[in-house]
């Protein structure tokens, strides 16, 4: 039975240029996790594997890092990035556990109504 | 000035699908995420999704997966909404509306589609 | 999903009352970068939602100064200073944060 629960950071609004930190966190559950995965849309950006550790699609490479802990920085933002980002857990004896976060990236200029946009 | 302009109502048959069309204008029409919003007897609201029409990244409530698919046409600046394998349950009025930039709400709403799922 | 629990369900008022209304999610809606995405709608019969604040506090354009918000966390008010007869309708609180974005159940403000 899966028990476990995962929480995000949250939808995040970004300027474009700027960085953010994705990170999703397993809680509730004693199961091992084995493997995670971050994913936009059907596209893979990383892996951090137990025993291997991390692995960046080649096409993320020069704009994605990886943690802090199990988390991905996205650097160099663009509107194209815009979009939603999953975090699945591997995990055994449960299985797979998925978390959402939708990160909309905004054209510098636009800071409408006094948005306070992240730029770490 | 923003303005959403839905299509009409619907009447249609159980194991039907369908699509609602939601024209935009009065905005850079790439720029905004468009939502949908469903409101089922007349009271309770739920998010059914968005699309970002820039890139056509979409984000789905698990809860309408496989009824509902959001679509955009950005040469005529308009979102449609397909509903699948329509019940009684899709009997609702649906909702366009434009997401705010910066802050994850909905500031300029289409005048709703009412949806009718009968025999 | 994130659950939005807004109180009271119905507010009888008379005009020029002052009137609160609650809306309580099951987790905080402050992301990790402190940013909270809250917002209020009003649902007039015949009419679209439309919005009248959003982060927590923010007036939309066109939104009268009696309507105002506050909280954070978990914990958010709508305050409406002067009831008006077009302030009558169902009103809603909205959560941002956390995928999928969830509606309260709504507060029907209705004359005594």
């Known amino acids: 039975m899966m028990t476990g629960t995962i929480e995000t950071t949250g939808n995040i609004s970004a300027e474009k240029g700027g960085s953010i930190i994705l990170q999703c966190h397993l809680s509730s559950t004693t199961a091992q996790v084995t493997q995670v995965n971050w994913e936009q849309q059907d596209q893979l950006l990383a892996i951090c594997n137990a025993d291997l550790g991390w692995h960046i699609s080649p096409s993320f490479k020069d704009r994605v890092a990886p943690g802090p802990g199990l988390g991905l920085t996205l650097q160099s933002l663009t509107v194209n990035d815009t979009g939603e980002y999953f975090c699945i857990y591997h995990t055994y004896p449960d299985g797979t556990y998925t978390g959402r976060i939708f990160l909309e990236v905004l054209e510098s200029s636009v800071a409408e109504h006094g948005a306070r946009f992240q730029i770490p | 000035e923003v303005q959403l302009q839905q299509s009409g109502p619907e009447l249609v048959k159980p194991g039907a699908s369908m699509k609602i069309s939601c024209k935009a204008s009065g905005y850079s029409f790439t720029g905004y995420t468009m939502n949908w919003v469903k409101q089922s007897h007349g009271k309770n609201l739920e998010w059914l999704g968005l699309i970002f029409p820039y890139n056509s990244a979409t984000s789905y409530n698990q809860k309408f997966t496989g009824k509902a698919t959001i679509t955009v046409d950005k040469s005529s600046n308009t979102t449609y909404m397909e509903l699948l394998s329509l019940t009684s349950e899709d009997s609702a009025v649906y909702y366009c509306?434009?997401?705010?930039?910066?802050?994850?709400?909905?500031?300029?709403w289409g005048q709703g589609t009412s949806v009718t799922v009968s025999s | 999903d994130v659950v939005m629990t807004q109180t009271p369900l119905s507010l009888p008022v008379s005009f020029g009352d002052q009137v609160s209304i609650s809306c309580r999610s099951s987790q905080s809606l402050a992301n990790s970068y402190g940013n909270t995405y809250l917002s209020w709608y009003l649902h007039k019969p015949g009419q679209s939602p439309h919005l009248l604040i959003y982060g927590i506090s923010n007036r939309f354009s066109g939104v009268p100064d009696r309507f105002s918000g506050s909280g954070s966390g978990t914990d958010f008010t709508l305050k409406i200073s002067t009831i008006k007869p077009e302030d009558l309708g169902m009103y809603y609180c909205?959560?941002?944060?956390?995928?999928?974005?969830?509606f309260g159940g709504g507060t029907k403000l209705e004359i005594k």
């Open positions: 909205l959560q941002g944060t956390h995928q999928p974005w969830t």
């Open positions: 509306a434009r997401g705010l930039r910066g802050f994850f709400a909905l500031d300029y």
